[in-house]
Each structure stands twice: as C-alpha cells, then as structure tokens.
C-alpha cells in the first residue's frame, strides 16, 4: 500500500481467483484513543472499533472511503483504491490502446517546435467518475523539472455504438534550450482513477522524436503565363522554432482531387515556393517536416486550384 | 559563445554541402546498423545516450545562433579554447566566435573518426563479419574535416591488446552512431545558419 495523495491510498493486488489479497491496517488521524468506530462509504454498518482497523483487501467491495467516527462526529477519512496486477502485468482498463506508432501505446505526445513545450493525449470510453493527474520530468534518476497543467477533456467522438473521449494535457520543460542535444528522455506519468480503480501509464520520449510542425501558413497561388503550371508559395508556421535558417523545414507540395485514389502532382522542396500543375477541381496542399531530423510531417495546408 | 550574424561573401560555405553529406551518410549507416543488428539493443529507446565529446568540446554552445543567446537555458557554462584558422571562413569579417564554433565541430569529427576507426578495426576481426563501418561515412567525415581545415594535434588511434568483445563492440557502435547522428544534425543546422547569415 502507498499514498497517492493526502488520505488516498493505493492497494496493489495480485488479481486471480481466490487470491489472498492484502492485509491493510488503517489508522485514525486523531489524538483520541477510545470510542472510535469505522464505517465504509455511505454504510452505517460498523466494521470495527479502535484507533486502528485491520482489513483484508481482496476485491473492489473492500475498497472505498473508510471513515473513523466518535460520537457521531467524523474524525478522518482514508480512501482505498485498487491497482490490479494480472499475470504480472498491471491492468490497463481505463485507457484505450491507440496502437500508434506501436501496440500498447496509451499516451501520445507531440511538440510543435523545440521550445520544450509539448502536448500529450489519451483516449477512454469512460464518461464519469474519472480523474487524471499528470507528472513529468526530464530523466528519471536525477529528474529535471517539467511543469504540466491539468488534464482536460479535449474531444468527444462517436465510434460505432459507443462514445470515445479524448483528454489532453500541456507540459513545458522548465529550462529548455531549443538548440540542445537531448541525451535524457522526457518521462510522462499519468495517474488514472475510475471509481475505485487506480492505473498508471507512462511514456518516455525525446522532444526531437515527437516534433510535428504546424501546417505552413499563407498559401498563395500565381498562375504562370502560357502554361498549366502554377507557382505556389507559403511561409513557415508561426509556432516553428526560430531562427528558420537554423531550424529549417522541408516541404511536400501536392496537387490532388478529392479522392486519394486520384492522380496527383507531387514535389518536395526546401524552398518556400514550388511550381506545380493545377487541375480543375483539385487542391494544392503543402506540408512541412524538420529538414534535418525526420520526425512527423505536419498536417496539410490547402487551397483550391481554381 | 555565439555566432554573430556576419555577412560572409556569397557562396562562402563549402562546408554546407559536406555537412549535408555527413548527415545522410551517418543516417544511412545507423539505419543499416539497426537492420543488421536487429537482435541487439540498437534502437533509440534501447540504448544509453552517451556523448563522447561531453566536457571536451562545446559545439552546441559555441555554435549557438545569435537569436538564442537571450535564452538563459542555452548559455551553458562549458568553455573550451580552440585554434582559429579554417578554410570555411572565407570572409575576413568572420568573428572569433565563428572560428571557435567551426573548430569545435572539427574536434568533434576528429574524436568520432578515431572512435569509428578503432571500432572498425575490431569489427573486422569478428568471425561473424556481421557489420562494418561504411567507408563512405568515414570518407565524408574526412572531407568535412579537410573543408574545415584546422590544424590540430593528431589523436593516436586507440589500440587494444585484449580480445575484443564483439557483442559489446556492436552495442557501442549503435550508441556512437545515435550520438553522431544527433551531432550531425546540429552541424547541419549550424552550416545552414552560417550559409544564410
């Protein structure tokens, strides 16, 4: 058993049929010595008396808010949560496996630049009685500071018969140099509590590997005389690291109709303009990627050919 | 400890082309190592990230773009003194700081070159003959060093009398290649910045 936060404790249980469970001793936070009784949740049934209560925690029915009273007055609470271990593996029931970039990916993180700011998100089908707490650091043995905000519900989607909820959190490394060469990864830890179930999820990464620039901005077209060719120009996104001559981007320019199966014109360039062939009912799209370290491409920025 | 935005002569930078070749060569070599050593811990997640130049050179700090010198977190206290005569410095206006930066890059290359050559000598003794260093990568390191053209004491190649542990050597190769790729990215960024300045 360990303390998650004040008056909230996590009991780690090997979860299998007829498991013996864990013996837990609860102590009432009071100077009083006698006349103390214990109850669980809203029940008025007295579970025991005395300053300490010894319980055998085997299942979710044994978890919950234990309260010690004296003469009708509440003295203190202890909330017990369960953390299940099945076949030596901690349970991952609360969050959905996003399977990208590999199986057992519960947390996904992205950074728009090298400033040390990044966003992580996760998915769940659970809509109520759910709380998250996020901590992060650079390295684990001698951790350096990363400050994370509160996790918030950022999107709701309907997937088949059930709803899917996306939560996200923003974090900022306390003293980040955009030009630094990372040798210690960022560690992100998410504590998830659903009703009386506790789970924790972790992710470890280098900022350089989670870079995904914003799309290029200010796309403009200029038709070329006596030709089907069009000059398309754009600018670096505002959120990208500066100076741009140091943090350079490379671009992919594509002309395509509405369907992905349609024919297309595609060219890669390090410049902020390119010449392509425009077709009726097609769109010109441009996306960006770090020129020197190939992490993710940005989403497309698009303008219609016409 | 930073690069002032000098205005060098147009086309001053023969090093830009070489640095692009360097990044390409080390990335290809790393990819080859990952594929060939698929049953060894050779991915970014599996290896320890070591920097053989740590406390010996200060490339990131010495080559910091002017715009980042206002960022307290970028101004590390590591200082190293270097020789200052390089052929990439085609402009008389080139500052002492730029020379310091390029000479730091030269020292990095020299250190990695020695490590890679020592390692290759060991890998050539491996009866499995599983992986060797790409001669193109070694040649590209040499070309960039020549373009930088700094006078420097030659570092003797490390020779070892004991029987090499080939497993450890291959893991060390992965560690070195990952670190060298990161440094090659920095070098490319620096050359691009200097070329644009």
């Amino acid at each position: 058993i360990w303390e998650l936060k004040k008056d909230v404790y996590v009991v780690e249980l090997d979860w299998y049929p007829d498991a013996p469970g864990e013996m837990v001793v609860l102590t009432c936070d009071t100077p009083e010595e006698d006349g103390i009784t214990w109850t669980l949740d809203q029940s008025s049934e007295v579970l025991g008396s005395g300053k300490t209560l010894t319980i055998q925690v085997k299942e979710f029915g044994d978890a919950g808010q234990y309260t010690c009273h004296k003469g009708g007055e509440v003295l203190s609470h202890s909330l017990l949560l369960l953390h299940k271990k099945e076949d030596g593996i901690w349970s991952t029931d609360i969050l959905k496996d996003q399977k990208e970039p590999k199986n057992k990916t519960f947390l996904r993180c992205e950074a728009k630049n090298y400033s040390g700011r990044f966003t992580c998100w996760w998915l769940t089908t659970i809509s109520t009685d759910l709380t998250f707490s996020v901590k992060s650091s650079r390295g684990s043995s001698d951790p350096q500071g990363v400050t994370c905000g509160a996790a918030t519900l950022s999107a709701e989607r309907v997937r088949g018969d059930n709803k899917e909820y996306e939560y996200s959190v923003e974090c900022q490394e306390d003293s980040a140099c955009p030009a630094a060469e990372e040798s210690l990864p960022i560690e992100v830890m998410v504590d998830a509590v659903h009703k009386l179930k506790y789970e924790n999820y972790t992710s470890s990464f280098f900022i350089r590997d989670i870079i995904k620039p914003d799309p290029p901005k200010n796309l403009q077209l200029k038709p070329l005389k006596n030709s089907r060719q069009v000059e398309v120009s754009w600018e670096y996104p505002d959120t990208w690291s500066t100076p741009h001559s140091y943090f350079s981007l490379t671009f992919c320019v594509q002309v395509q109709g509405k369907s992905k199966r349609e024919k297309k014109d595609r060219v890669f360039t390090d410049k902020t303009s390119a010449t392509v062939i425009c077709r009726k009912n097609a769109s010109i799209s441009v996306r960006a990627q770090d020129r020197y370290y190939s992490s993710s491409w940005s989403e497309w920025a698009s303008v219609p050919c016409s | 400890r930073n690069l002032p935005v000098a205005t060098p002569d147009p086309g001053m930078f023969p090093c830009l082309h070489h640095s692009q070749n360097l990044l390409r060569a080390v990335s290809n070599m790393l990819q080859k190592a990952r594929q060939t050593l698929e049953f060894y811990p050779c991915t970014s997640e599996e290896i320890d990230h070591e920097d053989i130049t740590k406390d010996k050179t200060s490339t990131v700090e010495a080559c910091l773009p002017l715009e980042l010198t206002k960022n307290e977190s970028c101004l590390n206290s590591r200082e190293t003194s270097f020789i200052t005569n390089g052929s990439c410095l085609a402009s008389r206006k080139t500052s002492f700081m730029m020379a310091l930066c390029l000479s730091s890059i030269y020292e990095d290359l020299k250190m990695y070159q020695v490590e890679f050559k020592t390692m290759n000598a060991k890998l050539l003794m491996d009866p499995k003959r599983q992986i060797f260093l790409d001669q193109n990568m070694l040649a590209v390191i040499d070309e960039l060093m020549q373009a930088l053209n700094f006078n420097s004491e030659t570092v003797p190649q490390k020779s070892s009398l004991e029987e090499p542990d080939f497993y450890k050597t291959k893991i060390k190769l992965c560690i070195l290649l990952h670190a060298f790729r990161i440094r090659a990215v920095t070098i490319d960024r620096v050359m691009s910045y200097l070329n644009a300045s």
Partner: antibody, heavy 118, light 107 residues
Framework: QVQLVQSGAEVKKPGSSVKVSCKAS????????LHWVRQAPGQGLEWMGW????????EYAPKFQGRVTITADESTSTAYMELSSLRSEDTAVYYC???????????LGQGTLVTVSS | DIVMTQSPLSLPVTPGEPASISCRAS??????LHWYQQKPGQAPRLLIA???QSISGVPSRFSGSGSGTDFTLTISSLQPEDFATYLC?????????FGQGTKVEIK
C-alpha cells in the same frame, strides 16, 4: 495487370511525320497521366511530354514544342504521339509511360522503334 | 534544364558483391529523384521513387539515398538478374531529365 501495348516499328523519310499509338489495359484510362519518352540508340532517355486523358491537358518539353502532338482517345483507351518534320536524329525507340503521379513512371510500354532514313 | 550526371558509366561487379551507383544533379532537387532498371531490348522498370521510397514488387536489396544534388542507388548483393543499366530521373522541374545510365556488368 496493367499493360501498355504500343504500335509496331516504323521507317520514315526525313521531313515526314510519324504517329505512334499506345493502348492501355487494366485500370481506368483517365485515372493516369500518360507520357512519351524516347531513347536514341546507345543513349539515355529523353522526356517528350505528357497528357491528362481526363481533360486533354498537355505539356511538352521545350525541345519538342511545335513538333510533337500528344492526344488521347478515352473511348479506346489509346494515347497517340505524333512527331513531325522528322530528321535522322529522331531515330529512336519511343516509349509511352503512365502513372497516377505526374512526374515519374511506374509502367512503360514495350517501345516502338522509329527509324528515320532517306 | 537540370542536367543529371551518373557515375561510373560502367561498373564491373562480382555476383554476390554490393554495388553503388551515383547520380548528381546540376542544381538542388531535394528528393525528387527516381531510379529505373533497364535490360537490353526492354523498357525501363521503376525501382525507387523520391530518392529512397521502395516500390512494391522490387527486391529489398535495392535501396536509394540522398537529397539535394547527390544520390546513390545501392544493391546490397548483386544477383545474376541485376546485371543491367540503371538510370536516374529528376522530377524537380519540367522538362523531366534523365542520367545517361550506368551499366552494371559481370566482373
């Protein structure tokens, strides 16, 4: 299986014209760009131009501008390349090529040898 | 027009050995470079698109690298069927242009 089948070899006199055909099978004809490239004996490839069969749009290499005409007939899934004012240096194997991507070729025809000789 | 220069023009290789072919552009073309294989009397066949993207059905021993002006096609271990002429093509701008070809011959 996508195939491009070209018309047979031709022998032409200098100053005349030649029209080579390229019949596509497999896949929708208008879903692809169609190009013509040529290869003189012992030489590399030379790009001549492309057509978008969907709308008839064409683009020609400046070297052939005014001398080459590329057309397409959607009803027969056939593209044509006509080269006029032939000279001896036009002796080459002419290939049609296609792709959904405009700027390179994933399938090429078997080639048509055009010999220009007096 | 962008001029593509291949080297060497002829490359004698022992079967089972690796081979590398170089292609250089007269100006920077990013990764807009494609490789083809051509056997005598046959049409060219696409091997690699955009400098390094493998093409379905092409053996994995063929790989490409490079960007800007310098590109390389590598055959990790030459098989008897790989003895042919290899061509590079730029797609950075029209007119599309090709290298003059590198003939890989049996040593």
């Amino acid at each position: 299986q996508v195939q491009l089948v070209q018309s047979g070899a031709e022998v032409k006199k200098p100053g005349s014209s030649v029209k080579v055909s390229c019949k596509a099978s497999g896949g929708t004809f208008s879903d692809y760009y169609l190009h013509w490239v040529r290869q003189a004996p012992g030489q590399g490839l030379e790009w001549m131009g492309w057509i978008d069969p969907e709308n008839g749009d064409t683009e020609y290499a400046p070297k052939f501008q005014g001398r080459v005409t590329i057309t397409a007939d959607e009803s027969t899934s056939t593209a044509y390349m006509e080269l006029s004012s032939l000279r001896s240096e036009d002796t080459a194997v002419y290939y049609c090529a296609r792709n959904k991507e405009l700027r390179y070729f994933d399938v090429l025809g078997q080639g048509t040898l055009v010999t220009v000789s007096s | 027009d962008i001029v593509m220069t291949q080297s060497p023009l002829s490359l004698p290789v022992t079967p089972g050995e690796p081979a590398s072919i170089s292609c250089r552009a007269s100006q920077s073309i990013s990764i807009n470079l494609h490789w083809y294989q051509q056997k005598p009397g046959q049409a060219p066949r696409l091997l690699i698109a955009f400098a390094s993207q493998s093409i379905s059905g092409v053996p994995s021993r063929f790989s490409g690298s490079g960007s800007g002006t310098d590109f390389t096609l590598t055959i990790s271990s030459l098989q008897p069927e790989d003895f042919a002429t290899y061509l590079c093509q730029q797609s950075n701008s029209f007119p599309l242009t090709f290298g003059q070809g590198t003939k890989v011959e049996i040593k």
